[in-house]
Interface confidence: medium
Amino acid sequence: SEVEYRAEVGQNAYLPCFYTPAAPGNLVPVCWGKGACPVFECGNVVLRTDERDVNYWTSRYWLNGDFRKGDVSLTIENVTLADSGIYCCRIQIPGIMNDEKFNLKLVIKPAKVTPAPTRQRDFTAAFPRMLTTRGHGPAETQTLGSLPDINLTQISTLANELRDSRLANDLRDSGATIRIG
């Protein structure tokens, strides 16, 4: 099933996804992909965690929450209309057929007000790509960069609203949070 989330052009979009680790530090690998969750793995991977850390990401996609506590919500920085679409959060619980997968629909709306042109920070220059890695499947043979040092105030109001406990409970009810162990 799909849950819909909205953001405006130029904002950071927030796509919530949570699980409850069986024990502190007992992490489960997670992948985020652009597109609905396929048969297995994530299609068109944009970010991945393993049992210890974020081990793969692409330039505008990052985890702002405490993924070590199971908050694997995805932040997409400075969205454009092209970022609209379905995203897959897949919690890769070991074992056969155990994966939890969530399809989240991101709708990008044009900005209400066009601000005066400002010089955008060049993340390519600020955070050079410096490492190539191979993980599971071909999607990981890409370059990595350092995570942007970004101010929390840049996160859209949607992100803050979604942290509200009432909404968090709604998310749990809709199946976007799972407990492991």
Epitope: G35, E41, G43, N44, D50, P94, H136, P138
Partner: antibody, heavy 114, light 112 residues
Framework: QIQLVQSGPELKKPGETVKISCRAS????????MNWVKQAPGKGLKWMVW????????TFADDFKGRFAFSLETSASTAYLQIINLKNEDTATYFC???????WGQGTSVTVSS | DIVMTQTPLSLPVSLGDQASISCRSS???????????LHWYLQKPGQSPKLLIY???NRFSGVPDRFSGSGSGTDFTLKISRVEAEDLGVYFC?????????FGGGTKLEIK
Amino acid sequence: QIQLVQSGPELKKPGETVKISCRASGYTFTNYGMNWVKQAPGKGLKWMVWINTYTGEPTFADDFKGRFAFSLETSASTAYLQIINLKNEDTATYFCARDTMDYWGQGTSVTVSS
Amino acid sequence: DIVMTQTPLSLPVSLGDQASISCRSSQSLVHSNGNTYLHWYLQKPGQSPKLLIYKVSNRFSGVPDRFSGSGSGTDFTLKISRVEAEDLGVYFCSQNTHVPWTFGGGTKLEIK
């Protein structure tokens, strides 16, 4: 329903170039990666490449890094495989297969003969 | 590269019989995330391969329950409980755990 439709058979001479296509329908093209797989006559399957259709970035098997080019026309939901300087050993059926190889095209036969 | 070895090369069966195909990999196919990306395909003459079983034992949509997969690590088996005429063709195992993705050489299921 999900379909991958490939272009028709090709007969080429050694040294020539061939370009075959794979048109996807029934799903959003850029939401799933695309593979190309080679099958020589009477032989098994050999994975060639996986292309991230969202970023355009390919990952090759080592055997297919030289004379093989893989491209996308996302507006037409189409992936392309081009082989330059064709050799006899390129004679095969080439399949496109979606993402985790759950759906396949019907295959395109390429025959290289002088 | 991971080498996938299938046995037997050819498997003559009578309709209604059980058939069993083995696939062995040169390295463990257990990924660091705990999953095992071993899949089975059937290719009928003149057709493209069709996914039957993914991740060792999960039937793809529309695949009859007479097909089952099992195994772990490096040794895997595809079983067909009661062979029907439409099951004839070449069966391939495939691994997606390690790049490059590789296939077994195939097992031809044919009538005795």
